[in-house]
């Protein structure tokens, strides 16, 4: 999917909102240093392509993300702004029912959900050059 | 403007199934959550699950103990909830509730049906 | 599962009062996770409060929402008669979602 098209001020208000104390519930008694920083994006399009993959992909050791109320909120977000989005995800999402077993936050997933936490900062500050 | 008309009245015997609906239009069905949430009489509201429209993907309330299903029909912009193996205590008014992201973006149930009342009875 | 539990359940008020109604969560949520809703008899449920203290469009200035952590009120300045109604508190911060079991507030 291309991300161009979003409405990326609603986009970041929503997270700003309610997203980001999700992503905060979820790493509640995990350090803010615990984990580096490996995934990065360059402009708003480009991090909503990361942060899309990163929340509904499944991975290796974290296949459970997507059914966490940080991922539904940003489907959902998606979705309504961004035109066509819920039309494209059909493939995925059988995709990512066969990969969902059970909940369990793994360390893994913990990790992911810092390298999400960062790309979403990254979205809010799209003007700041490239580290 | 945003509408969620369900169907009607049901009366129902133990041990069957009710599948009720929900309607939705003025907006992009698609692309919101839609939200099933139960009151028996008297009682409060008890959320049964979800379902994206756009893709399937559902979220079911375990209490229910796999008895309901959440489906969703794209070209009627209709969704569905079925529940089997009613009993008594399954007698309530169920309702749709979208969900969205309000003028301050906080999420929460924005528009619901009128409710669909459902009675099981032998 | 969070639990909300809301009280008094039963509140009776006389015209221009103030009222105020509680929730108390079972766990630690995000203030823009807590909701209310209206419920009159007969009627569906209208959302009234979001994110613990943002007025629903339309709803009166005399209604305010506070709180943080666990602990959530609703206050009603000076009752009017249409303001008589069952308010429920909701979460959304964890699956499954849950409701409070409602404060029914009522002409004394």
């Known amino acids: 999917y291309d991300f161009t098209n979003c409405d990326f001020e609603k986009i970041k208000a929503a997270y700003l909102s309610t997203i980001s104390k999700d992503l905060i519930t979820y790493m509640s008694g995990t350090k803010s240093t615990e984990f580096n920083n490996t995934v990065s994006c360059s402009n708003r399009p480009h991090c909503l392509t990361e942060i899309q993959s990163l929340t509904f992909n499944p991975t290796a050791g974290c296949a459970s993300l997507a059914k966490e109320m940080f991922a539904m909120k940003t489907k959902a977000a998606l979705a309504i702004w961004c035109p066509g989005y819920s039309e494209t995800q059909i493939n995925a999402t059988q995709a990512m029912k066969k990969a969902r077993k059970s909940k369990v936050t793994t360390n893994k997933c913990l990790e992911q959900v810092s390298q999400l936490q960062g790309l979403w900062r990254r979205f809010n500050r799209p003007l700041l050059k490239q580290q | 403007q945003v509408q969620l008309v369900q169907s009607g009245a049901e009366v129902k015997k133990p041990g069957s199934s009710v599948k009720v609906s929900c309607k939705s239009s003025?907006?992009?069905?698609?692309?919101?959550?839609i939200n099933w949430v139960r009151q028996a009489p008297g009682q409060g509201l008890e959320w049964m699950g979800q379902?994206?429209?756009?893709?399937?993907?559902?979220t079911y309330n375990g209490n229910f103990k796999g008895r309901v299903t959440i489906t969703a029909d794209k070209s009627t912009s209709t969704a569905y909830m079925e529940l089997s193996s009613l009993r008594s205590e399954d007698t309530a008014v169920y309702y749709c509730?979208?969900?969205?992201?309000?003028?301050?973006?906080?999420?929460?149930?924005?528009?619901w049906g009128q409710g669909t009342t459902v009675t099981v009875s032998s | 599962e969070i639990v909300m539990t809301q009280s008094p359940a039963t509140l009776s008020v006389s015209p221009g009062e103030r009222a105020t109604l509680s929730c108390s969560v079972s766990?630690?949520?995000?203030?823009?996770?807590l909701h209310w809703y209206q419920q009159k008899p007969g009627q569906s449920p209208r959302p009234w409060i979001f994110?613990?203290?943002n007025l629903a469009s339309g709803i009166p200035a005399r209604f305010s929402g506070s709180g943080s952590g666990t602990e959530f009120t609703l206050t009603i300045s000076s009752l009017q008669s249409e303001d008589f109604a069952v308010y429920y508190c909701q979460q959304w911060s964890s699956y499954p979602l849950t409701f409070g079991g409602g404060t029914k507030v009522e002409i004394k």
């Open positions: 003025g907006y992009a069905f698609s692309s919101y959550w």
């Open positions: 379902i994206f429209p756009g893709d399937g993907d559902t």
């Open positions: 509730a979208r969900s969205g992201f309000d003028y301050g973006y906080f999420y929460a149930m924005d528009y």
């Open positions: 766990s630690s949520i995000s203030s823009s996770n």
């Open positions: 994110g613990t203290s």
